[in-house]
Interface confidence: medium
């Protein structure tokens, strides 16, 4: 069964750093989606070999990309005490798979000491459920509009 | 329950023009992205164009580009494909949709309801 890896379980930052999340698949996939989960989970970048990434306006212009769908790192730069979260990788397949989830803590640099990630994975209680028995996301509220490509980027 | 209907297809002779109307029903859909696709026999959903609700954003395939325009009418619930200088390569059966997701909006997994489709025949 497909599976994505996802690294690191956790990571506390100062604000104003960056931070990198891996997700990696055995490949087979049409896209990645970064979501930062919540009370209304929210899509952060969608990433497809081929296509421009396009990036929520929250994030417009403190992302980058290495790698490849089947192995993509996801930089997010200029971190704020907002960007606080889990975020998880959702593969789009014909199952949606999702990794097991980045807790990101950004802190104020003079509280690094207070609040630090232990070795452990985020719950899995704060993961979304797979999809059943659909290949499309579940509905959800956007709070922003993305950044989308320029159109001559679309395939 | 979120309704989509087009109209508006029909038979049309190479270099003609028509226009597709998406009439949406069922909620308020200001922050949705709307699109509109089409599909030949033995193949897959192709994107043609989207239009981010609220801001207004357009984006199109490249096949379409400059000929095909993608607007909405917020009084109406209503979006609308008019489409210019049709080909021959552009029968299909064109379906809008509607998402709130919005990232991947060329691809049909961004896309929540669906409405029934309406023909478009260009002859040469």
């Known amino acids: 069964a497909q599976e994505v890896q996802q690294s690191p379980h956790c990571t506390t930052v100062p604000v104003g750093a960056s931070v990198n999340i891996t997700c990696s698949t055995s490949g087979g996939l049409r896209g990645i989606y970064l979501r930062q989960l919540g009370p209304q989970p929210q899509d952060i970048i969608y990433y497809e070999d081929g296509v421009v990434p396009t990036t929520d306006r929250r994030f417009r212009g403190r992302i980058d990309f290495s790698g490849s769908q089947d192995n993509l790192t996801i930089t997010m730069h200029r971190l704020q005490l907002s960007d606080t979260g889990t975020y998880t990788c959702q593969a789009i397949t014909e199952v949606n798979v999702y990794g097991s989830g980045t807790l990101v803590l950004v802190t104020e640099e003079q509280s690094q000491g207070w609040h630090r990630c232990s070795d452990a994975p985020p719950r899995a209680s704060a993961l979304p459920a797979p999809p059943t028995g659909s290949a499309l996301p579940d509905p959800q509220t956007a709070s922003a509009l993305p950044d989308p490509p320029a159109a001559s980027a679309l395939p | 329950q979120v309704q989509l209907q087009e109209s508006g297809g029909g038979l049309v002779q190479a270099g003609g023009s028509l226009r597709l109307s998406c009439a949406a029903s069922?909620?308020?859909?200001?922050?949705?992205?709307m699109g509109w696709f089409r599909q030949t026999p033995g193949k897959e959903r192709e994107f043609v164009a989207a239009?981010?609700?609220?801001?207004?954003?357009?984006y199109y395939a490249d096949s379409v580009k400059g000929r095909f325009t993608i607007s909405r009418d917020n009084t109406k619930n209503t979006m609308y494909l008019q489409m210019n200088s049709l080909k021959p390569e552009d029968t299909a059966v064109y379906y809008c949709?509607?998402?709130?997701?919005?990232?991947?909006?060329?691809?049909?997994?961004?896309?929540?309801?669906w409405g029934q489709g309406t023909q478009v025949t260009v002859s040469s």
């Open positions: 069922g909620r308020t859909f200001s922050d949705y992205l």
């Open positions: 949709a509607a998402g709130q997701r919005g990232l991947a909006y060329a691809r049909t997994y961004d896309y929540d309801y």
């Open positions: 239009i981010y609700w609220n801001a207004g954003s357009t």
